[in-house]
């Protein structure tokens, strides 16, 4: 990139540069016509018959250098061929010399600095590549010469450029003074500012473009060369922030459109919002979940939104005394998640009708919550209680939902408690054909014993047809029609309103061999 300090092609008013000495044949400011047929201000000198060693000087106005260390001067000039000038002396030249002088202010006058190589600094002696020539009977022909010179290094606030003619017939058609700078550059989402090179190469720190963040690693830098070009080298750059994607050839970050998101900084483009989510604004790093949908804390920002599951279905209970086996089917709606678990809530109602959460005497196997399989075994149920179990399905977002958790209920009523087994049977009297038995009244928890059932059979006769039953309302019984001298096995169970209790242990009794022994009491 070139930054112009002076361009005479753009000047419309007289340039009014300083000449020295003030004599005839000096540089003269004239109107000219450039390649685009625009009128331009030019300087012409044509004193080809001067005395040897006599110089004509032309000096520009003071030019602020604007931070440039090296300045370039492009000269466009024409020059007449000495051979075409019949009256040209031997001092006719086809070259001229360019100088500069630095100063911190516009302090030069018509006489100072002294018009000589020191204090002026010589840049170059310029020779014409193309000479304008005229041959008799033909038009004059020629071409414009273009020459670019380099001035510097410069250190003061500004400078003057000077031209020394020592016998040429020439016109300075235009002077373009400029310096080179590295243009503002955006690469890999990193902006490098416009930089004026102060040395052969200058490191320049970059900054991230709007809505970009630095990539890991060293901060990005590029080298600005003296010729105003950025040195080609890979740039560890920046990347677009969450909610933004690279655009326009990696030169800017563009906000994700509505309905799209980008969760992380770095490469990659905005993606459509995942299931059950939306973004109503541009530049979304995350899509908001629809009402009733959530992301668990451990879910990635780009994960779909999910909802708690519906209730489990078809709870089946199997009661076995004080233990209960429950099993159910998975919910119809999983909520879009894999982390499905089940939990149970339990209430118990006493026979009198007062209800409360289940007590700690119940045990759940494998547990009351975090069940991964659709079943549980509940132990320690109390008789004649009504239990209500609410089976809920849960997933990773159930805790985020407000409102009631859907459940599938099941009611189970345990049997009332039957009398305990009758075990302390004793024989109060025996004969060859009968046995009189008595036992202690068992403690029935649910009301009094209504009656008893005695079960007996001859020892060794195990078939169902040999078993006989006898009901009695008293805690005694007489077994008649027995075999003489035979052994009998006897069991008793009690009945209350809750039903029969279990038979007690078998009691072993024996009838008398003969009648003479008579009735006698016999202890069990």
């Amino acid at each position: 990139l070139e930054e112009t300090l002076l361009n005479t092609k753009l000047e419309t008013a007289d340039l009014k540069w300083v000449t020295f000495p003030q004599v005839d044949g000096q540089w003269e400011e004239l109107s000219g016509l450039d390649e685009e047929q625009h009128s331009v201000r030019t300087y012409e000198v044509c004193d080809v018959q001067r005395a040897p060693g006599q110089a004509h000087w032309l000096r520009t106005g003071w030019v602020p250098r604007r931070g440039a260390v090296h300045v370039y001067a492009t000269l466009r000039f024409t020059m007449l061929e000495c051979l075409s000038l019949p009256r040209a002396g031997r001092s006719c030249k086809e070259t001229f010399t360019v100088f500069y002088y630095e100063s911190d202010a516009d302090t030069a006058t018509a006489l100072t600095p002294a018009w000589m190589e020191n204090p002026y600094i010589k840049v170059d002696t310029v020779a014409a590549e193309h000479l304008t020539r005229k041959r008799p009977g033909a038009e004059a022909t020629g071409k414009v010469n273009v020459k670019t010179l380099r001035l510097g290094p410069l250190s003061k606030a500004g400078f003057y450029l000077a031209f020394q003619d020592q016998g040429a017939c020439m016109a300075l058609l235009s002077l373009h003074l400029f310096y080179k700078k590295c243009a503002q550059l955006t690469v890999n989402l990193t902006r490098f500012p416009e930089t004026v090179p102060r040395e052969l190469v200058v490191p320049v720190a970059g900054s991230c473009v709007v809505d970009a963040v630095p990539a890991p690693g060293p901060s990005p830098s590029l080298y600005c060369r003296e010729d105003g070009q950025w040195a080609e080298q890979p740039v560890t750059g920046c990347s677009c922030a969450p909610g933004f994607e690279a655009a326009e050839g990696n030169t800017k970050c563009r906000a994700c459109a509505q309905g799209t998101f980008k969760p992380l900084s770095g490469e990659g483009s905005c993606q459509p919002c995942p299931a059950n989510s939306h973004s109503n604004t541009i530049g979304s790093a995350v899509c908001q979940c629809r009402v009733g949908y959530f992301r668990a804390r451990t879910d990635p920002r780009g994960a779909p939104c999910t909802t708690p599951p519906s209730a489990p279905r078809s709870v089946v209970s199997r009661l076995n005394g004080s233990s209960l086996h429950l099993e159910w089917s998975a919910p119809l709606e999983s909520g879009g998640r894999e982390d499905l678990t089940y939990a149970l809530r339990c209430r118990e109602c006493r026979p009198g009708g007062s209800c409360a959460p289940c007590g700690g005497d119940l045990t759940f196997d494998p547990g009351p919550r975090d069940l991964v399989e659709p079943w549980v075994v509940v132990r320690g149920l109390r008789p004649d209680f009504t239990y209500t179990f609410e089976v809920t399905a849960l997933n990773g977002v159930s805790s985020l939902a407000t409102g009631p958790v859907p459940f599938e209920p099941v009611n189970v009523t345990t049997d009332r408690e039957v009398p305990p087994a009758v075990s302390d049977i004793r024989v109060t009297r025996s004969s060859p054909s009968s046995l009189s038995l008595a036992w202690a009244v068992p403690r029935a928890p649910s009301g009094a014993v209504l009656d008893y059932e005695v079960k007996y059979h001859e020892k060794g006769a195990e078939g169902p047809s040999s078993v006989r039953f006898l009901k009695t309302s008293e805690n005694r019984a007489e077994l008649r029609g027995l075999k003489r001298g035979a052994s009998y096995l006897v069991q008793v169970r009690a009945r209350s309103e809750a039903g029969y209790g279990p038979f007690g242990q078998e009691h072993h009794s024996q009838t008398q061999l003969d009648e003479s022994e008579g009735w006698r009491e016999q202890l069990a």
């Epitope: 016509l33 024409t78 075409s84 000038l85 019949p86 005229k134 008799p136 004059a140 020439m170 016109a171």
Partner: antibody, heavy 126, light 107 residues
Amino acid sequence: QVQLVQSGAEVKKPGSSVKVSCKASGGTFSTYAISWVRQAPGQGLEWMGKIIPIFGDADYAQKFQGRVTITADESTSTAYMELSSLRSEDTAVYYCARSSYTILTTYYNYNAMDNWGQGTLVTVSS
Amino acid sequence: DIQMTQSPSSLSASVGDRVTITCRASQNINNFLNWYQQKPGKAPKLLIYGSSILQSGVPSRFSGSGSGTDFTLTISSLQPEDFAVYYCHQVSDTSDTFGQGTKVEIK
């Protein structure tokens, strides 16, 4: 502003010669083209020839070749046009005119004449 | 020498009229053509050079066009001071030539 001042009116006999001068005042002279143009009474403009003083030689219209001589003196910034073997049809106003741009300061040699002398009436009569 | 033919030789027009004068060269002269205006008793005045470049100080109602052999001078809205004789002038050759002139008169 450059001025071109021409010499005064002349009355000449047929067969004689006339030399008209054109003095340029102010600034560069050597690298501009100086043309000579004549205009007979009630007639149009007629280009006779031109000179670029620094080059010395002149270019002439075919019609006047051999009868006209255009010269320039750089030291006095004066151009001259001499016409010989005058005839009555050479009676005309003779103008000198300078080109808009020097030979060095124009990319295209349009030789457009933007400065004109006041004209010199040359009458050829016996 | 290259011959330049102007047409018309004369024309009558009113103030405000659009006037067009043409000039034809006997051979290709690229755009090396100039136009002049001359009023009675005065030296010619340069209007246009290079076929279409307006000389400094000349009103913008004057315009020129053309290249090769056919050229046009146009006055977009004739003013009282524009009644004069107009000449084309070719400078393509070492030997310049003028057209015979076009007189613009008041109708």
